[in-house]
């Protein structure tokens, strides 16, 4: 019998399948076909992995599913025949490993800075060759030392950088057979944080509804995760969180509402799979002060002591300083400073003292002039608050006024009894120990105020001057004044100094009279004549005007003339005498006029000016109008304002706030215009509230 | 009379400072009613006003905008006469230079006298 | 900044007639600050008018301003020979700026 195994010899791949097919030639029946294994053991039918069927008489199949190492060997296909004879055919079946990557997990993952190993482990029935590339080229051949292939075919990458990130590829080969496996392993570099705080110091001010930011910047790979602790606590932000707001990546902590319980040390936290680092901010949260306490107090003058206190809180801890309305107590020099919480007046009258949040005020040997209000002002880098409290001295009455004074018989006049009392006092005139008024004097009346009692007499005959007494009382005590009523005597003459002469008018300087006659001078009186003249022509001038400066300026004079003047001055009792005459000569025809002078009034809203204008000399022929012209330095001049030759001042108003102004003024005749006058301002700083106002006038 | 005397280079080279005097007769630098301007002239800009100096109780200057960050005007009341500084010149910078007085004592306001000029040129 | 244009650019005219020469402001002016310059070549300008209307010292009667607002006007009465040159108009309310120039020439 002739036996045949097909294919008559076999290479498996190790997990592949193969099966082979024993045919018989020749006419024998009854043929018994059998499979026998590589140890000699006989293969029985229907076994799940190699299986043996028998097809029909001529012809069986050996099937070898899912082949391993240990099926390699001769497999042996025997033919009984019905005579007991037998024939044989054999296969020689070979097993053998195909590259393969058994362990070469895809993605790697790595820290940064470590010596990575990435892992390549190939089964083979050969050895085979172990090529590692990146971006297509053979590592190897980048010649950086930081690569190195290890005995065991895996790749160490020394240092591994976040560069060195991406597909690296493990190719094996077997030469003998030509055979090429690869394994793309993506290799992922992971960063561990690092986090820095945007401020390693963060201040915010307590009790203001402010919020306050704390930003932490963080980087990494994979991004990192944020938390946040207050004190070493973890923050939660819970649902509708009345405290805290995260941003979404929670790099920002946003704290609400500040106040005091919120200065703490807070830790940001960024975390991820290399690692994790934190960073500190400390939030200081300032106070601004608050005056906690102080109170009223009541004295008696003279007595020896009495103390205010002001107590405040805040933070940093506030300095708390003194004043009255009419004097600053904490900024005035000091006498020794025994401890810097201790500080006397040079006068020695006060003595503040200051520890911590308390500061008293001290007043020794009190007088009335201490009463009033005092207000002590706790100040901190972050505000200040006032608070007042107010000393109530308690004092006998205490009397002043003018002593002398002068009035004439049918002018009235009233005596001036001002009082100083607490409580108040009630107030009696007499005159010679008579209380008044009184039968004897009806030409007397009194009027009482708060603060003063006056006296009002009406002398009819010399018996009317003389002395009268004011008495003051309340519980504390009494005083007495002394007045005395004075004849009073028209004004000496006043003294010329020097004429200065223009061609029309002439400015006259003049010395006050020594004597007034004890009543104020209300005028006066200039008189002046062409020398040969018989006739003085006069005027009167306001004597404050005139008291200004010295100065009457005449007008109406002819040029080129010589003219004597006098003065006079006048009193509530009349014309004092006449000074002696001052000759001059007026100046020829000039032609132009003399620049005005220019005085300043700031208004009261702060941004707007009365200019004055003070006519000089009108050069001989009548002003016909001036010219005002004006701007902010530095800015553009205003329209020209022309004004009529009455005017006395010009109104700039709408200026700007705080800014410099200079205005120009010429006074213009027929002859042609004068010489500019010249006036420089700065208008106030702008106030919160801004009065109304409007356009230049003139007046 | 009033009269203004200009000296200086006429060629400064570019990103140098052209620096020009005017020196005063007949009136004072320091008056309070009137002003020291410098104004140039070239056909590609025509008259051009560059700046002032001028006392009201302190100096004062104004400057044009196109100029503003390179200009400095200032007065020497010593040798009363006022100077002009412009600084990191170009050839645009070619122009003849005029230096003026605003005349406000006499109410003219204008520039009523003028310098005899300079031609500055802009060269390296 | 206050823009000045004049027009025309060149008037060609014979002594004895009369010029009329425009100015024109890109914003309001007052006239309390409008100057006319005359310039010959290779001198400085010399102020002709100020204030509009104004005659300068030593101005002949035969110039003459006029004008409000934006428009102002510089005439010539009767061309004499040596008003031949380039005029100017300037404001001064503000940061001072001038116009390009008419040039008045001979026909």
């Known amino acids: 019998l002739q036996v045949d195994i097909v294919p008559s010899q076999g290479e498996i791949s190790v997990g592949e399948s193969k099966f082979f097919l024993c045919q018989v030639a020749g006419d024998a029946k009854d043929k018994d076909i059998s499979w026998f294994s590589p140890n000699g053991e006989k293969l029985t039918p229907n076994q799940q992995r190699i299986s043996v069927v028998w097809n029909d008489d001529s012809s069986s199949t050996l099937t070898i599913y899912n082949a391993n190492i240990d099926d390699a060997g001769i497999y042996k296909c025997v033919v009984t025949g019905e005579d007991g004879s037998e024939s044989e055919a054999t296969v020689n079946v070979k097993i053998f490993q195909k590259l393969m990557f058994k362990n070469a997990p895809t993605p790697q993952e790595f820290r940064e800075g470590e010596d990575a190993v990435i892992v390549c482990d190939v089964v083979s029935s050969l050895p085979p060759t172990i090529i590692w590339k990146h971006k297509g080229r053979d590592v190897i051949l980048k010649k950086d030392v930081r690569f190195i292939v290890l005995s065991n075919n895996y790749l160490q990458i020394r240092g591994i950088k976040k560069t060195d990130e991406g597909t690296y590829r493990c190719e094996g080969r077997i030469l003998a057979r030509g055979e090429i496996n690869f394994k793309d392993i993506q290799v992922i570099v992971n960063v561990p944080p690092t986090i820095q705080a945007r401020q390693n110091i963060v201040n915010a001010t307590a009790n203001l509804g402010q919020s306050v930011t704390l930003v932490c910047d963080a980087e990494g790979f994979p991004e990192p995760t944020m938390s946040w602790t207050k004190d070493g606590e973890q923050i939660e932000q819970e649902e509708d969180d009345e405290k805290y707001i995260f941003s979404d990546d929670s790099s920002q902590l946003t704290i609400k509402k500040v106040d005091k319980n919120d200065e703490a040390e807070y830790i940001c936290i960024a975390e991820n799979k290399a690692g994790e680092q934190d960073a500190t901010i400390h939030l200081k949260v300032f106070a601004k002060p608050k005056i906690t306490y102080v109170e009223n107090q009541t004295a008696m003058e003279l007595e020896e002591q009495v103390t205010l206190t002001c107590e405040a809180s805040g933070d940093p801890i506030p300095s708390i300083t003194w004043r009255t309305s009419t004097r600053n107590i904490s900024s005035e020099e000091k006498a020794s400073w025994t401890r810097p919480e201790k500080q006397e007046t040079l006068d020695g009258h006060m003595v503040v003292r200051s520890h911590a949040r308390v500061s008293s005020l001290t007043l020794k040997s009190i007088q009335y002039t201490d009463a009033g209000e005092y207000i002590c002002t706790a100040s901190n880098t972050i505000g200040q608050d006032s608070q007042s409290m107010y000393l109530e001295v308690q004092y006998a009455p205490k009397l002043q006024g003018p002593v002398a004074v002068y009035t004439w018989e049918g002018n009235q006049v009233n005596i001036t009894c001002e009082v100083f009392a607490y409580p108040s006092a009630t107030i009696s005139w007499f005159r010679d120990g008579q209380l008044l008024p009184s039968s004897n004097y009806s030409n007397i009346k009194i009027y009482n105020t708060p603060s003063a009692s006056y006296l009002e007499v009406t002398p009819d005959s010399e018996n009317d001057f003389g002395n009268y007494n004011c008495t003051a009382v309340n519980r504390i005590g009494q005083e007495s004044l002394e007045f005395i009523l004075v004849q009073a005597d028209t004004p000496s003459s006043p003294s010329i100094d020097q004429v200065e002469p223009y061609s029309s008018t002439a400015q006259v300087q003049f010395d006050e009279p020594e004597a007034t006659g004890g009543v104020p001078i209300l005028k006066y009186k200039a008189e002046w004549r062409a020398v040969g003249e018989e006739v003085w022509h006069s005027k009167w001038y306001d004597a404050k005007e005139a008291s200004m400066e010295g100065i009457v300026t005449i007008v109406g004079l002819k040029p080129e003339t010589t003219y004597a003047v006098r003065l006079a001055a006048l009193n509530g009792k009349g014309l004092g005498e006449i000074s002696a005459a001052s000759e001059f000569k007026t100046q020829p025809v000039q032609g132009e006029p003399s620049a005005p002078k220019l005085e300043g009034q700031m208004g009261e809203d702060g941004n707007s000016i009365k200019v004055n204008l003070i006519k000089q000399d009108d050069g001989g022929s009548p002003i016909r109008h001036y010219l005002v012209r004006y701007r902010a330095l530095s800015s553009e001049w205003k329209p020209e304002i022309r004004l009529p030759s009455g005017s006395d001042h010009v109104m700039l108003k709408s200026l700007d706030w705080n800014a410099e102004y200079e205005v120009y003024v010429v006074a213009e005749n027929q002859q042609g215009k004068s010489k500019a006058a010249h006036f420089v301002f700065r208008t106030s700083a702008q106030p919160t509230a801004i009065p109304a106002n409007g356009s230049p006038t003139s007046g | 009379q009033v009269q203004l005397q200009q000296s200086g280079p006429g060629l400064v080279k570019p990103s140098q400072t052209l620096s020009l005097t005017c020196a005063i007769s007949g009136d004072s630098v320091s008056s309070n009613s009137a002003a020291w301007n410098w104004i140039r002239q070239s056909p590609s800009r025509g008259l051009e006003w560059l700046g002032r100096?001028?006392?009201?109780?302190?100096?004062?200057?104004d400057y044009a905008v196109s100029v503003k960050s390179r200009i400095t005007i200032n007065p020497d009341t010593s040798k009363n006469q006022f100077s002009l500084q412009l600084n990191s010149v170009t050839p645009e910078d070619t122009a003849v230079y005029y230096c003026a007085r605003e005349n406000i004592a006499a109410w003219t306001w204008a520039f009523d006298i003028w310098g005899q000029g300079t031609m500055v040129t802009v060269s390296s | 900044e206050i823009v000045m244009t004049q027009s025309p650019g060149t008037l060609s005219l014979s002594p004895g007639e009369r010029a009329t020469l425009s100015c024109r402001a890109s914003?309001?002016?007052?006239?309390?600050?409008l100057a006319w310059y005359q310039q010959k070549p290779g001198l400085a300008p010399r102020l002709l008018i100020y204030d509009t209307s104004l005659r300068a010292t030593d101005i002949p009667d035969r110039f003459s301003g006029s004008g409000s607002g934006t428009a102002f006007t510089l005439t010539i009465s009767r061309l004499e020979p040596e008003d031949f040159a380039v005029y100017y108009c300037?404001?001064?309310?503000?940061?001072?700026?001038f116009g390009q120039g008419t040039k008045v020439e001979i026909k």
């Open positions: 914003q309001s002016v007052s006239s309390s600050y």
């Open positions: 100096t001028y006392y009201r109780s302190k100096w004062y200057n």
């Open positions: 300037q404001q001064y309310g503000s940061s001072p700026t």
